[in-house]
Interface confidence: low
């Protein structure tokens, strides 16, 4: 048994006679043999759920759900209740109605076994019938909405008549009807004015019925019509078995370059026309089990359940449904040597589903784990300027497909054939598993005999120690020119183009800093700044070379304070800046300020 509403509303007036009918509450059956039996909670409640008093005024007919006054609510009774309402004016009181045999404690009132009945209190006697407006004669102030469970026996869930009006104004004729399209499952009995369902409802066909209740008032010669919405919501039960959209119960996947823990290898989607169990209960009651089989697979993969509400079209209206994505996820990093093919089965069990049929599906994942071979091109040829400063990035080495790698830890090393010409260093980029080549020793770079540098690049997979090798041939070009005195260590210090381009700084491949002219569009990612190389700095990312020294690219790497209009980078640096941004790495400060309009024209004229 369950209530067709969680709350009812009626008006209460002072001195209404004992025996005045107030309203009906309605229970609907979950099973055909059920017989509703109603009981009232012991207490009346006021503002903020304050328990006011034992309910001595209102009764309920156990079998019909009719609430009525068993004694008149007089002024003194009202004052008695008002005093207990924590000083708030007593405008509304409520009662709890329970459905027997549901043995809910008085303190709790949760639908479906309990409903609240609210009474708006008017500290006056019932108004003269002639003064009541048609709206007041027809409907309560608060518009009702109804909840009906799907697949349950049909039954009466509402009674249109306002009982106090009918009781106290017998000469006013009030008629009701429901405006509804053909074939809808509701009827309003013309004599009793009871609204009932004609047959069991199916939420998967229609979830909401936006009906209209029409009330016609005849008082003497006048006839007036009032219309109000009459919404019915169909409540779901787990009556739909999970299914595979388009019958797809198998997903095939190849694990090759993406071998990192938590990588989603494959996804299978399960559709369930139901929206129960509710989200809080869903993962506990809608279970997925990776079936036992190969213990390697059990340890290597897990299944993640990602449910989502969706809506589907049914009979011209949209109803909610659930899609469950089951993701096969790597439970650990796989070494590049692992090589297996297997079938995994996942049992999905909609444990609340009662049939007919089984609420169980088997998902199949065909997974091939392929080994990864490390390959480097036979030779790399690069050139570097003799003027390049320390930490200048001059190129990249990368094993085949390294950009696609994840979960594969490749380390690069350089072995120099000439000990005195060991100019370059290499660091491994965590982002794309490449090796960034950079100038490590500028002294060696300037030696005349170091015009050609020969290295062996060795890429090693840290987990398996497998290796790949390549020759690296670096040509040193140009001649060294000492830079002007007074130049800062960091290009980022320079605030103007001219001073920027006159100096070099850490990380500069040409021995000169580069000016990046911004777009001048407020706080922008493309702010004006001085950089060792605009290819790499600033790019919103503090790369593995830039982390070696804060002077290389504080625009990307600074953890200190940024003054002026900006958006901070995540987790450091300047994501966007206003005008020109320059930095003082030693002081751990950057400044973003409006462009100086005089620069560079003024500087040119003033020379």
């Amino acid at each position: 048994l369950y209530f067709s509403r969680d709350a009812y509303w009626e008006k209460l007036y002072v001195d209404q006679a004992a025996g005045t009918p107030l309203l009906y509450v309605h229970a609907l059956r979950d099973a055909p043999e059920e017989v509703p039996s109603f009981r009232l909670g012991q207490h009346l409640y006021g503002t903020y759920r304050t328990r006011l008093h034992e309910n001595n005024w209102i009764c309920i007919q156990e079998d019909t759900g009719l609430l009525y006054l068993n004694r008149s609510l007089d002024h003194s009774s009202w004052e008695k209740l008002s005093v207990r309402n924590r000083g708030f004016p007593l405008l509304t009181v409520y009662l709890k109605v329970f459905l027997s045999p549901t043995s809910l404690r008085e303190g709790e009132c949760q639908w479906p076994g309990c409903a609240r009945v609210y009474f708006s209190f008017f500290n006056t006697s019932f108004p003269a019938c002639s003064s009541l407006k048609p709206r007041e004669l027809c409907f309560p102030e608060t518009r009702p909405s109804f909840r009906i469970r799907e697949n349950r026996p049909p039954g009466t869930f509402h009674q249109f008549r306002l009982l106090p009006v009918q009781f106290l104004c017998p000469n006013i004729s009030v008629a009701y009807r429901l405006l509804e399209g053909e074939g809808l499952p509701f009827r309003c009995a013309p004599d009793s004015l009871e609204v009932s369902t004609r047959w069991a409802l199916d939420r998967e066909q229609r979830e909401k019925y936006e009906l209209v209740a029409v009330c016609t008032v005849h008082a003497g010669a006048r006839e007036e019509v009032v219309m109000v919405p009459f919404p019915v919501t169909v409540y779901d039960e787990d009556d739909s078995a999970p299914t595979f959209p388009a019958g797809v119960d198998t997903a095939s996947a190849v694990v090759e370059f993406k071998r990192k823990e938590d990588t989603v290898v494959a996804t299978l989607r399960v559709f369930d026309a139901d929206v129960v169990p509710a989200s809080g209960e869903l993962v506990r009651r809608y279970t997925s089990t990776l079936l036992p089989g190969d213990t390697w697979a059990q340890q290597t993969f897990r299944v993640e359940h990602w449910p989502n509400e969706t809506s589907v079209q049914a009979n011209g209206s949209f109803v909610r449904a659930t899609v469950h994505d089951y993701r096969l996820v790597l439970n650990r990093n796989l070494s590049i040597s692992e090589n297996r093919t297997m079938q995994l089965a996942v049992l999905v069990n909609d444990s609340d589903f009662q049939g007919p049929g089984a609420g169980v599906l088997l998902l199949h994942f065909n997974v091939s784990v392929l080994p990864v071979s490390l390959h480097l091109p036979s030779t790399y040829s690069l050139s570097v300027s003799r003027r390049a400063r320390r930490f200048a990035q001059i190129g990249k080495v990368c094993v085949e497909n390294c950009q696609a790698f994840s979960g594969i830890n490749v380390q690069y090393k350089l072995h120099s054939s000439g000990a005195n010409c060991s100019t370059l260093g290499v660091v491994t980029s965590a982002e794309d598993t490449s090796g960034i080549l950079f100038v490590n020793d500028t002294k060696a770079l300037r030696r005349p005999k170091c015009a050609e540098l020969h290295y062996m690049v060795v890429a090693t997979d840290q987990q398996t120690s497998r290796q790949a090798q390549a020759q690296l041939l670096v040509t040193v070009e140009g001649s060294y020119v000492a830079e002007e005195a007074g130049c800062p260590l960091s290009c980022a210090v320079s605030k103007r183009r001219l001073e920027c381009e006159e100096c070099g700084g850490l990380g500069s491949p040409t021995g000169r800093c580069e000016w990046r002219q911004g777009d001048g569009k407020g706080i922008t990612r493309n702010f004006s700044t001085c950089s060792p190389s605009t290819k790499t700095c600033p790019d919103g990312h503090c790369d593995v070379v830039e982390t070696q020294d804060i002077n290389i690219c504080p625009q990307d790497c600074l953890r200190g304070s940024i003054v002026g209009g900006h958006e901070p980078g995540e987790p450091r640096g300047i994501k966007a800046g206003y005008g020109t941004c320059n930095c003082f790495p030693e002081e751990e400060k950057c400044f973003c300020e409006p462009e100086d309009i005089q620069d560079p024209l003024c500087d040119e004229l003033c020379r």
Epitope: D249, T250, T287, T289, L291, P292, G293, D294, T295, W296, A297, R340, T341, M342, Q343, A345, L347, N349, A358, V360, L362, H364
Partner: antibody, heavy 125, light 107 residues
Framework: EVNLEESGGGLVQPGGSMKLSCVAS????????MNWVRQSPEKGLEWVAD??????????HYAESVNGRFTISRDDSTSSVYLQMNNLRAEDTGIYYC????????????????WGQGTSVTVSS | DIVMTQSHKFMSTSVGDRVSITCKAS??????VAWYQQKPGQSPKLLIY???TRHTGVPDRFTGVGSGTDYSLTISSVQAEDLALYYC?????????FGGGTKLEIK
């Protein structure tokens, strides 16, 4: 038609060893996981061990009671599965069946779809 | 390990009767239950898996039902050839475990 034929049973003293063989026919042996199951009046049906496929590196599982004493192996070229039993005990007595997991349309269901006729093993002094 | 309990060692029935053999798992096995039939002097034969799916060639008078921990095998109209030992097995988790068996006898 699936056919499984066990051999190698007999009488052995406690602490002794024995090797059971099972030859399969009527299906593609290399595509199927294989099992040994035993039956005794005292313990009823008891799963003993299974062995997976080449693609799963011939992974094996054992019942706790035989782990470390019994070894399951297979030879796909002769469609044979073996059970090497060492350090035998009186409670290992029973009929030993070779069985194959049922392969449905999509997957191996971990149920024993086909069984041999069994070979009797008695461990007694 | 999951323990499978068949509470009836013997069940007596007549040809044409409907009979249900029950099996209880020590934990929720998510319908991963199989049923086997073993006739005297023969090896067991698979009847049902996944609680209710009939194996190839099994007559439709054999029906499996259940969920959670409680499962049963029903023979809707017992035939003389159905006299046998019936075992349940959980295929939820290794080690696979069997019930003690129920012997179906004719009155």
């Amino acid at each position: 038609e699936v056919n499984l034929e066990e051999s190698g049973g007999g009488l052995v003293q406690p602490g002794g060893s024995m090797k059971l063989s099972c030859v399969a026919s009527g299906f593609t042996f290399s595509n199927y996981w294989m099992n040994w199951v035993r039956q005794s009046p005292e313990k009823g049906l008891e799963w003993v061990a299974d062995i997976s496929l080449k693609s799963n590196n011939y992974g094996t599982h054992y019942a706790e009671s035989v782990n470390g004493r019994f070894t399951i192996s297979r030879d796909d070229s002769t469609s044979s599965v073996y059970l090497q039993m060492n350090n035998l005990r009186a409670e290992d007595t029973g009929i030993y069946y070779c069985a194959v997991y049922y392969y449905g349309v999509k997957f191996y269901y971990f149920v024993l779809g086909y069984w041999g006729q069994g070979t009797s093993v008695t461990v007694s002094s | 390990d999951i323990v499978m309990t068949q509470s009836h060692k013997f069940m007596s029935t007549s040809v044409g009767d409907r009979v249900s053999i029950t099996c209880k798992a020590s934990q929720d096995v998510s319908t991963a239950v199989a049923w086997y039939q073993q006739k005297p002097g023969q090896s067991p034969k698979l009847l049902i898996y996944w609680g209710s799916t009939r194996h190839t060639g099994v007559p439709d008078r054999f029906t499996g039902v259940g969920s959670g921990t409680d499962y049963s095998l029903t023979i809707s109209s017992v035939q003389a050839e159905d006299l046998a030992l019936y075992y349940c097995q959980q295929h939820y988790n290794i080690p696979w475990t069997f019930g003690g068996g129920t012997k179906l006898e004719i009155k």
